[in-house]
């Protein structure tokens, strides 16, 4: 059998291999050692017994999409049946005090490969023997601790394969410089050690994408916006646009990146080298946001100009793949730069919202029969922008972290947007009050620290007699800018 017979459904073409040469990978036309690495078709009954205690699942992930020329990394993680794990020596053991269908196991090992390899004979002194080889016959690399690696992973894509010895998790990186753009398929087959041979335990496949467009994501956030994911924002408040470029292999690390914004509101083009930008829409409506990201990245050089025509001379017949018999252009010089572009487009809706909320007065409410611990305080609140439909107050400790009480209630406010919110405080002390006004699309917050004094009957009585004038002088109630600082920190990534 050949590798493509084992690893794929269909034999890939030489055309595919020639057009996608992966550095360090081998042609899947190579022979597969079926004696050492048996091949089982899907549905073969032997799969049922390929692992003690159930089936092993292989999970294949990648950091796709990959910008052509960058590295893409594939990770395979083995998920063992319940109560099983790999120990420091690479053996598979039962987790302590873990109960599965078979109950608690007396034998701590599922597979004790260490014992087997110490027991093993037939070695030639170098630690190399006829069974410490990959499916194509290449010997295992002797990294430190290689004997504790008991799984063989065979990766297969684009008519080529890559073999790796590993533990329950492996990663493989591939440079995409020679990979055809578009979606591609990676398939992985995993074998485990079994005496002097190997047994297949899992197969997995995943699609990855190679692109010549910079993968771009934009997060949009705005103070007072109720739901940042619905692409509806508020008029007259800055929106923060933060651009994230998906570049896990840091291919663009040394590139100058330009961001060209069109906000769709006739404010023209805005070009920046900063990945974060603020923009304020001053009109309601629907706007088309467009971003173009440009980066000068390492890329292929244009081919040299063709030589002047010359009389045709006999040319050698087609050599093996990779000998470039058909006038394949020169391999790109690594120093060439090419402009890469990424695009992002969104339609955003701008609506009225509550722009600002302020507590302009705090007043102690005199009670004819004062409670022993309870104080009522009125907060006089103003707002700008749209009219709120609900008010929430959160009363917490002076650090504004430990909530003691939270109340929300609907409100009916006139167009002047002036309302009084009454809240009860249990006992004297300093409190943090978060007061939020909300409507369908916005949520505006303000915070105040207030000090509630001790209540003695005399002072209460005296205040009552004074007719309630100037009572807020009793309180040391300074509005603080805590909410501004907090909000800024939250939204700038």
């Amino acid at each position: 059998k050949r590798f493509h017979d084992v690893l794929g459904n269909e034999r890939p073409s030489a055309y595919m291999r020639e057009h996608n040469q992966l550095n360090g990978w081998s042609s899947d036309e190579n022979d597969w050692n079926e004696k050492l690495y048996p091949v089982w078709k899907r549905g073969d009954m032997r799969w049922k017994n390929s692992w003690k205690g159930g089936r092993v699942q292989a999970v294949l992930t990648s950091d796709s999409p990959a910008l052509v020329g960058s590295n893409i990394t594939f990770v395979v993680n083995l998920v063992f049946p319940r109560c099983q794990k790999e120990d420091a020596n690479g053996n598979i053991v039962y987790e302590k005090n873990c109960r599965n269908e078979a109950g608690l196991s007396a034998d701590p090992y599922v597979y004790n490969w260490t014992a087997w390899s110490e027991d093993s004979d037939g070695e030639n002194g170098t630690g190399q023997s006829h069974h410490n080889v990959f499916p194509d016959g290449k010997p295992f690399p002797h990294h430190p601790g290689w004997r504790r690696w008991n799984f063989v992973y065979v990766f297969h894509t684009l008519g080529q394969y890559f073999q790796k010895l590993g533990r329950c998790s492996v990663r493989v990186s591939v440079n995409t410089a020679n990979v055809t753009l578009g979606p591609q398929l990676m398939e992985v087959t995993v074998y485990r050690r079994h005496g002097r041979a190997y047994v297949p335990i899992a197969q997995v496949k995943d699609v990855y994408v190679v692109t010549d467009q910079i993968p771009v994501f934009v997060t949009m956030s705005q103070k007072n916006d109720r739901n940042s994911s619905d692409e509806t924002f508020l008029k007259d408040l800055p929106i923060t646009f933060d651009v994230l470029i998906h570049d896990p292999s840091h291919f663009l690390n040394y590139s100058t990146i330009n961001y060209k914004w069109s906000f769709g509101d006739n404010t023209g083009l805005f070009v920046s080298i900063n990945h974060t930008v603020n923009h304020t829409y001053v009109l309601n409506g629907t706007f088309s946001l467009n971003l173009t990201v440009k980066a000068a990245a390492p890329g292929p050089c244009p081919p040299p100009p063709p030589p002047p025509p010359r009389p045709p001379k006999p040319t050698p017949s087609l050599g093996p793949a990779g000998d470039n018999p058909l006038g394949l252009s020169e391999i790109p010089d690594e120093n060439c730069q090419i402009n890469r572009y990424g695009h992002f487009q969104a339609t955003i809706t701008i609506v009225e919202g509550i722009l600002e909320v302020n507590i302009i007065q705090t007043t102690d409410v005199l009670m004819l029969v004062p409670g022993p611990d309870s104080s009522l305080i009125d907060f006089v609140v103003t707002c700008q922008g749209s009219i709120p439909t609900e008010v929430c107050t959160i009363i917490s400790d002076p650090t504004c972290e430990i909530t003691q009480n939270a109340v929300c209630s609907p409100v009916d406010v006139d167009e002047m947007c002036l309302l009084t919110v009454r809240r009860a405080f249990n006992g004297s002390g300093t409190y943090c009050v978060n007061l939020t006004l909300g409507d369908d699309t916005s949520l505006a917050l303000t915070s105040t620290l207030i000090s509630v004094p001790d209540r003695d009957p005399a002072s209460s009585l005296r205040m009552a007699n004074s007719g309630g004038g100037g009572l807020n002088d009793i309180f040391e109630a300074q509005k603080i800018e805590w909410h501004e600082h907090h909000h800024h920190h939250h939204h700038h990534h």
């Epitope: 055309y15 595919m16 578009g182 010549d212």
Partner: antibody, heavy 119, light 107 residues
């Protein structure tokens, strides 16, 4: 939808050169190799070569090596095929055809350009 | 280079009857073989790729089979609009090659 639109018919004298264009639209131009196939009157199809619009790598059939040059203009999504030292047996309809990913079969073809070489 | 041999050169079949065209390659190209239909004054039209997969929009009377070096295009019930020249093409390796063509006519 995918479209490949070729330049018009040409009449050339022996020894001259001809440059045929193929303008692509309806897909990401740099993602697919473009091939050139020719067909002499009453004859079969003959593959001439291919070019990758992304990096301008080329593969030419041995028969045309040294006489054919394939180039790309990414700004206009156009591929060019230039054939030099023309002879009468180069009289043919020249087609551009787009391959599909990693597979060299052709679902999309240009309408063809007739090149006549005559003294 | 891979040599493609298509047979027969021409074929006359009654309407509604089966038409079979063969394509032989000088080396194993399996499954990288495509079939095209070409009518006068038009570019070729892809029918079958990778030996047996019918391309989008191609009527199911067209089918491909074969492996290794021997491949077949079958038109199960010939229609008037199927009169054309049919070509096989190996897409296994470059240089790509086409068969010489088979002209299908109505008997």
């Amino acid at each position: 939808q995918v479209q490949l639109v070729q330049s018009g018919a040409e009449v050339k004298k022996p020894g001259a050169s001809v440059k045929v264009s193929c303008k692509a639209s309806g897909y990401t131009f740099t993602s697919y190799w473009m091939h050139w196939v020719r067909q002499a009157p009453g004859q079969g199809l003959e593959w001439m070569g291919e070019i990758n619009p992304y990096d301008q790598r080329t593969n030419y059939a041995q028969k045309f090596q040294g006489r054919v040059t394939m180039t790309v203009d990414k700004s206009t999504s156009t591929v060019y095929m230039e054939l030099s030292s023309l002879r009468s047996e180069d009289t043919a309809v020249y087609y551009c055809a787009r391959s599909t990913g990693n597979y060299a079969w052709f679902a999309y073809w240009g309408q063809g350009t007739l090149v006549t070489v005559s003294s | 280079d891979i040599v493609m041999t298509q047979s027969p050169d021409s074929l006359a079949v009654s309407l509604g009857e089966r038409a079979t065209i063969n394509c032989k390659t000088s080396q194993d190209v399996s499954p990288s073989l495509a079939w095209y239909q070409q009518k006068p004054g038009q570019p070729p039209k892809l029918l079958i790729y990778s030996a047996r997969y019918r391309y989008t929009g191609v009527p199911d009377r067209f089918s491909g089979s074969g492996s290794g070096t021997d491949f077949t295009l079958t038109i199960s019930s010939l229609q008037a609009e199927d009169v054309a020249v049919y070509y096989c093409q190996q897409h296994y390796s470059i240089p790509l090659q086409f068969g010489g063509g088979t002209k299908v006519e109505i008997k």
